[in-house]
Amino acid sequence: KFSKQSWGLENEALIVRCPRQGKPSYTVDWYYSQTNKSIPTQERNRVFASGQLLKFLPAAVADSGIYTCIVRSPTFNRTGYANVTIYKKQSDCNVPDYLMYSTVSGSEKNSKIYCPTIDLYNWTAPLEWFKNCQALQGSRYRAHKSFLVIDNVMTEDAGDYTCKFIHNENGANYSVTATRSFTVKDEQGFSLFPVIGAPAQNEIKEVEIGKNANLTCSACFGKGTQFLAAVLWQLNGTKITDFGEPRIQQEEGQNQSFSNGLACLDMVLRIADVKEEDLLLQYDCLALNLHGLRRHTVRLSRKNPIDHHS
């Protein structure tokens, strides 16, 4: 709870925000969890705390570890944890999965690729962009503010895109790179009223208290690239992100698949450490596109563990 993963490369700048944010202006203290040693606030240190931000200028592999931040108040201290991993730079071009930020999809009409985490840094335009380690050149590529725009997107534009920028701290410059995958959606096709393949309407899913459970919401929307198609889960009519129960999370990003030529999306709802109160909730799988919205409701019931007799 109140924990966030962050990663970076050695000799680059890394800035991490306290996962337990208070409002601006609150005092935030940072500690290295393993030793409970306070992180200094003086900027002359390579690693220092600056309010809600923890700065590694530059980062070293040995900085890896869990950092504790405490947002201070005389009546209500609030604690968060930043799990930081610093990796050695790769000698070859491949960017390993553990350094990749979330995948984004684009089409001929919409081809923005945002540079991940850039808002945490003090940077100035322009950004440098690379695809599969090659610097992007040509009029089709436009670096605009914190994102890359690709004109006339083609299937061949799919790949790993790296943004590179300079963070400036008190006159000193530090390099930062961040990589994410870009996939291209086919524009031809048609759309239909959403068809939910799973779960069945009013399905009862058996779960074991204390165990983890997954619910998959899967729907098809037509053929080819779909404009404004989404599947999502709701709890008691509330979006998962708004419901605010950290044990219950939607899988980041919607998986796209093509079943019999149809464009389908699925979203996995992960429930960690199932509790009694989870059985009282109504789980709605929603599929929506320009044609409308379809909803299938699931409820959980307790699965009685099977007795094992010798």
Epitope: T27, V71, S73, P74, R78, G244, E245
Partner: antibody, heavy 117, light 111 residues
Framework: QVQLQESGPGLVKPSQTLSLTCTVS?????????WDWIRQPPGKGLEWIGY???????YYNPSLKSRVTISRDTSKNQFSLKLSSVTAADTAVYYC??????????WGQGTLVTVSS | DIVLTQSPASLAVSPGQRATITCRAS??????????MHWYQQKPGQPPKLLIY???NLESGVPARFSGSGSGTDFTLTINPVEANDAANYYC?????????FGQGTKLEIK
């Protein structure tokens, strides 16, 4: 967006127990924050009654502590106020609210409770 | 308990003019570099709404006409320029220690 709604009887007899419930939508009360009760007698100022934190810890105003209990029902995403041995001086609009750090950031619309025989 | 005393109890200000409300604490509400005083606005029939936190920080979405200042025991809420829809009761609140307490309120009327 956090939303709060108070519910409970609008009329309570003297010496009885006032019971109110606050239903929270848009956020789980076990995820974070503190969940407050505040009251305001007609035409008067605000008085903090107490709160229950996401962790279940409770903090009460000492002036009311002997008569107050704040509890929660996590399965319904609700928290409740019980105020015993009420008198006419307990007549007020009762608000539930959310404290994110030190300030009450989201409020219910309030419910008027009158203590009268 | 920390007692908060607001003054004046009421004031009337013309649109475009400045309104100043003060709040005095019975002991310091500042500690460890922060000042734990906050301001709320309450219109008739509505719950209070947070305006200023930590003495001088404007809450998100609140117009910049509102500002707060002060430290230790003496605090000021300023509205400049006042608009017609600023007519309301204004309360200070501290969070230096338990119990959290409010001032008795100041009623702002628009001439």
């Amino acid at each position: 967006q956090v939303q709060l709604q108070e519910s409970g009887p609008g009329l309570v007899k003297p010496s009885q127990t006032l019971s109110l419930t606050c239903t929270v939508s848009g956020y789980s009360i076990t995820s974070d924050y503190a969940w407050d009760w505040i009251r305001q007698p007609p035409g008067k100022g605000l008085e903090w009654i107490g709160y229950i934190r996401y962790s279940g810890d409770t903090y009460y105003n000492p002036s009311l502590k002997s008569r107050v209990t704040i509890s929660r029902d996590t399965s319904k995403n609700q928290f409740s106020l019980k105020l015993s041995s009420v008198t006419a001086a307990d007549t007020a609009v009762y608000y539930c609210a959310t404290t994110m750090m030190d300030t009450m950031d989201y409020w219910g619309q309030g419910t008027l409770v009158t203590v009268s025989s | 308990d920390i007692v908060l005393t607001q003054s004046p109890a009421s004031l009337a200000v013309s649109p475009g003019q400045r309104a100043t409300i003060t709040c005095r604490a019975s002991k310091s509400v500042s500690t460890s570099g922060n000042t734990y005083m906050h301001w709320y606005q309450q219109k008739p029939g509505q719950p209070p709404k947070l305006l200023i936190y930590l003495a001088s920080n404007l809450e998100s979405g609140v117009p910049a006409r509102f500002s707060g200042s002060g430290s230790g025991t003496d605090f000021t809420l300023t509205i400049n320029p006042v608009e017609a829809n600023d007519a309301a009761n204004y309360y200070c609140q501290h969070s230096r220690e338990f119990p959290l307490t409010f001032g008795q309120g100041t009623k702002l009327e628009i001439k």
